[in-house]
Interface confidence: low
Amino acid sequence: LQDLCSNCPAGTFCDNNRSQICSPCPPNSFSSAGGQRTCDICRQCKGVFKTRKECSSTSNAECDCISGYHCLGAECSMCEQDCKQGQELTKKGCKDCCFGTFNDQKRGICRPWTNCSLDGKSVLVNGTKERDVVCGPSPADLSPGASSATPPAPAREPGHSPQIIFFLALTSTVVLFLLFFLVLDYKDDDDK
């Protein structure tokens, strides 16, 4: 006996109780492929979900999340509460990002600021709860004769790399020594 069910198009199901006739999917159900023995129940977008695409006889409904929530999982299987930028969602609700971390989205977790020193660079713009730090040029780029399109790094701010600290300390020491010897020399001239 030929299987007539293979002739049943999407939007119908093969009803064996009716000599394998193609019956239309009942209300609120669908079949997305031909030859199906049953229709699938349409997804209902209720509560925190809202309908993005209505169910048709050949395709399931598609859901989105209502305002203030965002989709998680395949085909928006869950809705998670939005937070503000600079926050992350915890079990106790939205919490501000800790110092040294940021979140520039309404979803997800706070991430650590970029460690500019790992790339041998300096911090050009400090990080905030909402924004990552902006890395500037490396100390080597600041040496005389080095050409760089990047503007020079500002003075020391929290989060500066050890290279910069060492460079500034060395410069300060040399300047102090020079001043010290200049003063001594001046005194010697006075004594004569």
């Epitope: 049943c8 198009p9 999407a10 939007g11 119908t12 009716r18 006739i21 193609c22 019956s23 239309p24 999917c25 009942p26 209300p27 609120n28 669908f30 031909g34 209505e54 169910c55 048709s56 006889s57 050949t58 395709s59």
Partner: antibody, heavy 117, light 107 residues
Framework: QVQLKESGPGLVAPSQSLSITCTVS????????ISWVRQPPGKGLEWLGI???????NYNSALKSRLSISKDNSRSQVFLKMNSLQTDDTARYYC???????????WGAGTTVTVSS | DIQMTQSTSSLSASVGDRVTISCSAS??????LNWYQQKPDGTVKLLIY???SLHSGVPSRFSGSGSGTDYSLTISNLEPEDIATYYC?????????FGGGTKLEIK
């Protein structure tokens, strides 16, 4: 705005073929089915067939041998072809949109076809 | 094929009347029944789908009921614009079939 519009030859000679086009707007043929229905003068409605979003078809068994429904999704057009017309095929031919639970929620205004020599 | 019979081919009623139009199927159709209104100019509109669900934009004076083989359309408070022919249609089994229609006139 959802609309369906039938366009046909008006007059067809007996034993000749009939071709009618249903042009739709405001929705996609990849989402909705289209059915053809006809109404002879002074008589009731007769379902001819349906073309599903995926392109599959079902026909009225009494007319299946001389009926063909096809479509062009990109042009938003559905085509009805009927062979070997006789005088009793004289009717107003409608296309109608088949919504998800198999009701015809939007109908065209219909096109009158007269089979006469 | 499933035969759909509308036993009353025409009926006359007054404005404000409650009118019931019946439709009978030659075998059980599991509530897979729709009702349509055809105006004298040939315009066809859906009124009721799946036996009793009111289509959007249709006045609430229209209602549908029934089960098994016997179904009906009721207009609770007849208005002059309800002058039309009413058709039932089954979609339980191919080929889908319409009733012969009931022409409603105003007295």
């Amino acid at each position: 705005q959802v609309q369906l519009k039938e366009s046909g030859p008006g007059l067809v000679a007996p034993s000749q073929s009939l071709s009618i086009t249903c042009t739709v707007s405001g929705f996609s043929l990849t989402t909705y089915a289209i059915s053809w229905v006809r109404q002879p003068p002074g008589k009731g409605l007769e379902w001819l067939g349906i073309i599903w979003p995926g392109g599959g078809t079902n026909y009225n068994s009494a007319l299946k041998s001389r009926l063909s429904i096809s479509k062009d999704n990109s042009r938003s057009q559905v085509f009805l072809k009927m062979n070997s017309l006789q005088t009793d095929d004289t009717a107003r031919y409608y296309c109608a949109r088949g919504a998800g639970t198999w009701y015809f929620d939007v109908w065209g205004a219909g096109t009158t076809v007269t089979v006469s020599s | 094929d499933i035969q759909m019979t509308q036993s009353t081919s025409s009926l006359s009623a007054s404005v404000g009347d409650r009118v019931t139009i019946s439709c009978s199927a030659s075998q059980g159709i599991s509530n897979y029944l729709n009702w349509y209104q055809q105006k004298p100019d040939g315009t066809v509109k859906l009124l009721i789908y799946y036996t009793s669900s009111l289509h959007s934009g249709v006045p609430s004076r229209f209602s549908g009921s029934g089960s098994g083989t016997d179904y009906s359309l009721t207009i609770s408070n007849l208005e002059p614009e309800d002058i039309a022919t009413y058709y039932c249609q089954q979609y339980s089994k191919f080929p889908w079939t319409f009733g012969g229609g009931t022409k409603l006139e105003i007295k």
